[in-house]
């Protein structure tokens, strides 16, 4: 009922709570002397469903049969209408339409940890749209039944707040949930279990790792568990990996030896627990322990390469380069590299430790036979040294690889191909492909890159340190014993027309011809490997097509003669540069008038 209902009553039959699809009879009746003043026969009773009129009747009472009410709550209000006055509210009623509860399904109970409390969950089934009370019962030993009620409409979880103890772990407990509302009741199927079935241990805690004698091969993982835990599973992985290694252990009593860890690697460890071999469930995984394994001495050998440069008649510069060991080979933080340089005939040797660099340059006499050895050291020891005899890598012309080509292969890759040398190809022990950014000044500080290729290969894809729109000087070496032959080529992974043309810095007259000198185009404007320069000239103030001279690009060249100019004629000259993608805009214009005699 709603409101004070002083003037009358609204009654609902059979009930204010009805099953979906049922019919209700609603009666609105006025109390004595509560009708329209002087005009009791003019009483007009009106029944509203929410704000919509559904029935009216003249007199002291109104009967209405209502069907098709939707799930949920519907409000009915009865009002009195008298002549020349507003409608007066008499009384009202709410009707609750719903369904009886369905049988709760999939009842399951769990106790988190030996000290936790029993909590159960279930599926309610479809919404009843009515106030529904759930009662969860737990029956067990000593003829005892606990029950807990939940008065929340959407109840599908209850925690009893009681703790099952392991005094008799095989004792049976039975849980059942019953849903009750005004239209009926329904109980779940009983769920029977033992302490061991439902107790889910707490995850292990206080996880630690110890390495005996700072060795990765003597590693023990320690943790703490609840008292009844019988089984553990361990999972661990390098921090940068997505794949776990799994180990199952029984009766570990909080410790386990791990034998397959890699040195100098950060690992993540987690542990889970279970009370019984085949009963119950695994705990959640513990919080992660992150720990780094100790170093071990490096394995593997450094990949070493070198470059020789002539200084003068008695001296040469040797530049050594080596690649970092992989993480799995370094097995620790590399503290320094040890470089030993030895003259093989005289036995003179010099050793130096290099930190922070992977290259070393020294000057040695051009005479004698020289060898180097390079090794990497961490806190536990050194790698085996890589030994190299210093030789003239390009001396043996017959060992030079033939038909070397360099072609762009997708983004930032260059495919280098070659043919074996003319000399017995079977003599080749390995090829080395070397590349470095092309700098017109032949700058020795430019980083050197290389890769080794097996003797039966005739191609290599180079991708390390390759940038778009940069020209690389590429050399292919064929090595055989203490001899080497080489061939070189220029290549780029991506090219376009140069952004500018060469800058003419001087024009000089020499015996009836001129010598044009220019500045190289800045590397960042070359946009790949230059193939040609073009020198253009035409008579000043002439509309004729310019003449041109095309010069093949050579790294060191920055001047060229022209001998086809007429004396005492003023010419305008300019230059462009070309890559395989096209020609640059022209560089600066210079005027020149040849003073020599006419032919």
């Amino acid at each position: 009922k709603i409101d004070a209902c002083k003037r009358g009553d609204v009654t609902v039959k059979p009930s204010h709570v009805i099953l979906l699809g049922s019919t209700v009879n609603i009666t609105c009746s006025l109390k004595p002397r509560q009708g329209c003043f002087h005009y009791s026969r003019r009483n007009k009773l009106i029944l509203y469903k929410f704000d919509r009129r559904i029935n009216f009747h003249h007199g002291h009472s109104l009967n209405s049969q209502v069907t098709g009410l939707p799930l949920g709550t519907t409000l009915f209000v009865c009002k009195l209408a008298c002549i020349n006055s507003d409608e007066i509210q008499i009384c009202g009623a709410e009707i609750f339409v719903g369904v009886a509860p369905e049988q709760p399904q999939n009842l399951s109970c769990i106790q988190k940890g030996e000290q936790g409390t029993v909590a159960c969950t279930w599926e309610r089934g479809r919404d009843t749209h009515l106030y529904t009370e759930y009662t969860l019962q737990l029956s067990g030993p000593k003829n005892l039944t606990w029950q807990k009620q939940c008065k929340d409409i959407y109840c599908d979880y209850l925690d009893f707040g009681i703790n099952l103890t392991p005094e008799s772990p095989e004792s049976n407990f039975t849980a059942k949930v019953t849903a009750v509302n005004s239209l009926g009741s329904s109980s779940s199927l009983p769920s029977t279990f033992t302490f061991l079935d439902i107790v889910r241990p707490l995850p292990p805690w206080d996880i630690r790792i110890k390495f005996q004698k700072a060795s990765v091969s003597r590693c023990t993982l320690y943790w703490r568990d609840e008292g009844l835990v019988l089984l553990n599973r361990l999972r661990y992985r390098p921090s940068n990996s997505r794949l776990w290694n799994m180990v199952n252990v029984t009766k570990a009593k909080g410790r386990h030896d791990l034998l397959d860890l890699k040195p100098f690697t950060e690992y993540e460890f987690q542990i889970s627990s279970k009370l019984h071999l085949y009963k119950g469930s695994w705990s959640d995984w513990s919080e992660s322990l992150r720990a780094q394994t100790p170093e071990e001495e490096p394995t593997g050998m450094l990949d070493v390469w070198y470059m020789k440069r002539h200084i003068d008649y008695s001296r040469q510069q040797i530049s050594l380069f080596w690649k970092n060991l992989s993480v799995s080979e370094a097995r620790g933080k590399i503290l320094h590299y040890q470089v030993t340089l030895q003259e093989l005939t005289g036995g003179k040797a010099m050793t130096q430790n290099i930190t922070g660099h992977t290259s070393w340059t020294t000057v040695i006499p051009r005479t004698g036979n020289w060898a180097v050895a390079v090794s990497a050291a961490n806190s536990k020891g050194s790698s085996l040294p890589t030994r190299i005899n210093i030789m003239n890598l390009c001396e043996a012309g017959l060992l030079a690889p033939r038909q070397v080509s360099a072609n762009s292969e997708g983004m930032d890759n260059i495919l280098v191909t070659w043919q074996p040398p003319r000399k017995d190809p079977s003599a080749v022990q390995e090829y080395v492909v070397e590349w470095r950014e092309l700098h017109p000044g032949g700058d020795t500080q430019v980083p050197l890159n290389w890769l080794r290729s097996r003797p039966y290969n005739v191609s290599a894809l180079i991708s390390e340190n390759i940038k778009s729109y940069i020209c690389y000087e590429i050399r292919v070496y064929a090595l055989s014993g203490d001899q080497g032959g080489c061939s070189s080529i220029l290549g780029n992974s991506k090219h376009k027309a140069p952004l500018s043309g060469p800058h003419i810095n001087a024009i000089t007259e020499e015996k009836g011809s001129i010598l044009i000198s220019w500045n190289s185009i800045p590397v960042q404007e070359q946009m790949g490997c230059l193939l040609h320069y073009r020198i253009y000239w035409k008579e000043r103030d002439s509309n004729s097509q310019p003449q041109l001279c095309e010069i093949p690009y050579r790294v060191s060249q920055n001047s060229h003669p022209i001998n086809s100019l007429q004396p005492r004629v003023t010419y305008v000259l300019w230059m462009t540069a070309l890559t395989a993608a096209g020609e640059s805009s022209h560089g600066n214009e210079r005027e020149f008038c040849l003073q020599g005699k006419a032919n």
Epitope: T117, K142, W146, K148, F160, G161, T165
Partner: nanobody, 129 residues
Framework: QVQLVESGGGLVQAGGSLKLSCAAS????????MGWFRQAPGKEREFVAV????????AYVDSVKGRFTVSRDNAKNTVYLQMNSLKPEDAAVYFC??????????????????????WGQGTQVTVSS
């Protein structure tokens, strides 16, 4: 110091009903679990039912489950035991008891007399066949 006074006992026919009340005074009623025990002549005191402080958790001995209902009204400091479908073997002196709060409630907590600090004098229930 909590005082407990039971009432509502008496003689009833088998199959009949009784409602026992237990009024508490002298303590914070809502902080105690309230239990009902019974003792027949020559037998040990037996647990019947308990209602926890919140009122939504109860426990019963299986022999009364479905017939007896324990409830409490914290505003009135009273606990009730509604007994329906009484049997001759239900005849006994019924005691009300107040149990101290515990840090952890085990399955058998509040089902033994030693779990309770305060006891009433008891009320006699007789069931005739």
């Amino acid at each position: 110091q909590v005082q407990l006074v039971e009432s509502g006992g008496g003689l009833v026919q088998a199959g009949g009903s009784l409602k026992l009340s237990c009024a508490a005074s002298g303590g914070t009623f809502s902080s105690y679990a309230m239990g009902w025990f019974r003792q027949a002549p020559g037998k040990e005191r037996e647990f019947v039912a308990v209602i926890m402080r919140s009122g939504d958790t109860t426990a019963y001995v299986d022999s009364v489950k479905g017939r007896f209902t324990v409830s409490r009204d914290n505003a009135k400091n009273t606990v009730y035991l509604q007994m329906n479908s009484l049997k001759p073997e239900d005849a006994a002196v019924y005691f009300c008891a107040a149990g101290r709060p515990v840090t952890r409630t085990y399955y058998h907590t509040y089902t033994y007399p030693h779990d309770y600090d305060y006891w009433g004098q008891g009320t006699q229930v007789t069931v005739s066949s």
